[in-house]
Amino acid sequence: EKLPKAPVITTPLETVDALVEEVATFMCAVESYPQPEISWTRNKILIKLFDTRYSIRENGQLLTILSVEDSDDGIYCCIANNGVGGAVESCGALQVKMKPKITRPPINVKIIEGLKAVLPCTTMGNPKPSVSWIKGDNALRENSRIAVLESGSLRIHNVQKEDAGQYRCVAKNSLGTAYSKLVKLEVEVFARILRAPESHNVTFGSFVTLRCTAIGIPVPTISWIENGNAVSSGSIQESVKDRVIDSRLQLFITKPGLYTCIATNKHGEKFSTAKAAATVSIAEWSKSQKDSQGYCAQYRGEVCDAVLAKDALVFFNTSYRDPEDAQELLIHTAWNELKAVSPLCRPAAEALLCNHLFQECSPGVVPTPMPICREYCLAVKELFCAKEWQAMEGKAHRGLYRSGMHLLPVPECSKLPSMHRDPTACTRLPYLDYKKENITTFPSITSSRPSADIPNLPASTSSFAVSPAYSMT
């Protein structure tokens, strides 16, 4: 008769590598007498004999996992006990190996230039896959803007136009490689004006073409605004090339105006807009205004309310579709420009502009606007606003229109009637009369070039002393 023998595990468990959905087997060979009872644990939890995912054979010495799942990894132990001596145990690890799998692939993205884009790429696999990205046909290089995150996602800071293209992520480990489908990164760019329309000073009745070019993704649309309203006349020609839209507005000029080019494109539900403006002024505007039709009425606007004589009738030019509104917009635009000029110049320029745009009016059979007297215009130009006027004229000669007074509908002083010839034919500016009496701080540089044609005028220098010869009364 055999002697009782305590169990001995003759083939200890080893680490088993297994692929998902494949079979994994642990062998636990035991010598003992009587025959031992063998049980199995996974991570110290007993594996039940009736669990259909497992097969236990050879008197319990063979444990087979029939279809490995990634959750099966862990420490497996066999415990043998036959009542002789103590129970014995041997343990081994199951490492579930897995080919790379992309669980959250990237998707198509539209992003606005300058923002941050993140293309997801979440993966599974054992060993843990390394993730790289391909743009077009080339491996994507990381830099200060472009990084592959720990999660596998691709992060692009400060997205640029050149980042647009087709991307795919690649997950790789020792068992294989997985590719995502190609996705498209579209970079949208806010509308931006590349070439603003230029201001023009033209003769009445001439043709002018205003040109505005804009860029953006999607390609912007361009609309034109005239004195705040949609352009009522003129023809527009447009062309698009390489995401640049070129719009040309051809106008027949019968009145001065502020023309605004508005470039707009859409980003999802939102729009981006860029604007640029140009003025079209008419040489000898007073003359063309005088020749045009109009009516006399009280001024109802806001801008010139404090400047114009109370309850005076002013001239409204009916060559505008809405004279009140158009003239008010012109003066409002001028007013904003005047924020840049000196405190000495500003009130004088305001008085000049208001009385020029809203000329005093004689209501007769033919309503007649009364222009400003030449002497007052010159006082503003050569005394109160000498510095600004000089700067403006200098910039005009060089083709630069940037500061202070360039947008202003200023009269050409030399073309205005002199009050010395006919005091009833022109309008005085009471503000200047008042200021003349109160000026004590002007620079004492007197004119070196007297005006031959008009008496009692300062000559065209940049600053003046008020002398008795300079008479506006």
Partner: antibody, heavy 121, light 112 residues
Framework: ELQLVESGGGLVQPGGSLRLSCAAS????????MSWVRQAPGKGLEWVSA????????YYKESVKGRFTISRDNAKKTLYLQMNSLKSEDTAVYYC??????????????WGQGTLVTVSS | QAVVTQEPSLSVSPGGTVTLTCGLS?????????PDWYQQTPGQAPRALIY???SRLSGVPSRFSGSFSGNKAALTITGAQPEDEADYYC????????????FGGGTKLTVL
């Protein structure tokens, strides 16, 4: 479609306050002057207040000066009328109306449906 | 404060012509008052017809016209239609001193 929708009306005791709002849509709000006009039950129209496109000035009927304040929020496309020290004679339907151009005064070419203000104890 | 005056009521036959006037209790109505005309039917908000004396708003039938008649502003309906039965208000801009926009008392027009 151009729309002006008034709100904020209701029953208030004499001496009380109300704030009317007028939400504008379907046009470029900040290009136009706006007005409030009221109509007492069974009576004619009465201009109350006006404001130009940029809110630079405000104008009022003499009897409401110092009690009513007109204002606008161009970003929100909304016109307001703050009414304080209300009197029984302020009872009316209050209409918000759009001016045909930028300045405060002129033809009112679009009107809301009105909101009723009742001042009563 | 000047009062804006209108006929309290007028009537016209369908197809007929009627003139509504708008005056001032003291003085004349001029282009500086920028006369505007409005139509209001029962239960509805007013509707602008004519602005600044004689300019018709878009969508307003050509049978409505504005003018001056003596020292008053006038609204003429030529070829009146049944749907023209309404209250008509004129409004004047008052620029002297503090600015105001003043409505007349309204004219009740009946199309018989």
């Amino acid at each position: 479609e151009l729309q002006l929708v008034e709100s904020g009306g209701g029953l208030v005791q004499p001496g009380g306050s109300l704030r009317l709002s007028c939400a504008a849509s379907g046009f470029t709000f900040d290009d136009y002057g706006m007005s409030w006009v009221r109509q007492a039950p069974g009576k004619g129209l009465e201009w109350v207040s006006a404001i130009p496109w940029n809110g630079g000035s405000t104008y009022y009927k003499e009897s409401v000066k110092g009690r009513f304040t007109i204002s606008r929020d161009n970003a929100k496309k909304t016109l307001y009328l703050q009414m304080n020290s209300l009197k029984s004679e302020d009872t009316a339907v209050y209409y918000c109306a759009k001016r045909s151009g930028r300045i405060a005064f002129g033809a009112l070419d679009a009107w809301g449906q009105g909101t009723l203000v009742t001042v009563s104890s | 404060q000047a009062v804006v005056t209108q006929e309290p009521s007028l009537s016209v036959s369908p197809g007929g012509t009627v003139t509504l006037t708008c005056g001032l209790s003291s003085g004349s109505v001029t282009s500086s008052n920028y006369p505007d005309w409005y139509q209001q039917t029962p239960g509805q908000a007013p509707r602008a017809l004519i602005y600044s004396t004689n300019s018709r708003l878009s969508g307003v039938p050509s049978r409505f016209s504005g003018s001056f008649s003596g020292n008053k502003a006038a609204l003429t309906i030529t070829g009146a239609q049944p749907e023209d039965e309404a209250d008509y208000y004129c409004a004047l801009y008052m620029g002297s001193g503090s600015r105001n926009y003043v409505f007349g008392g309204g004219t009740k027009l009946t199309v018989l």
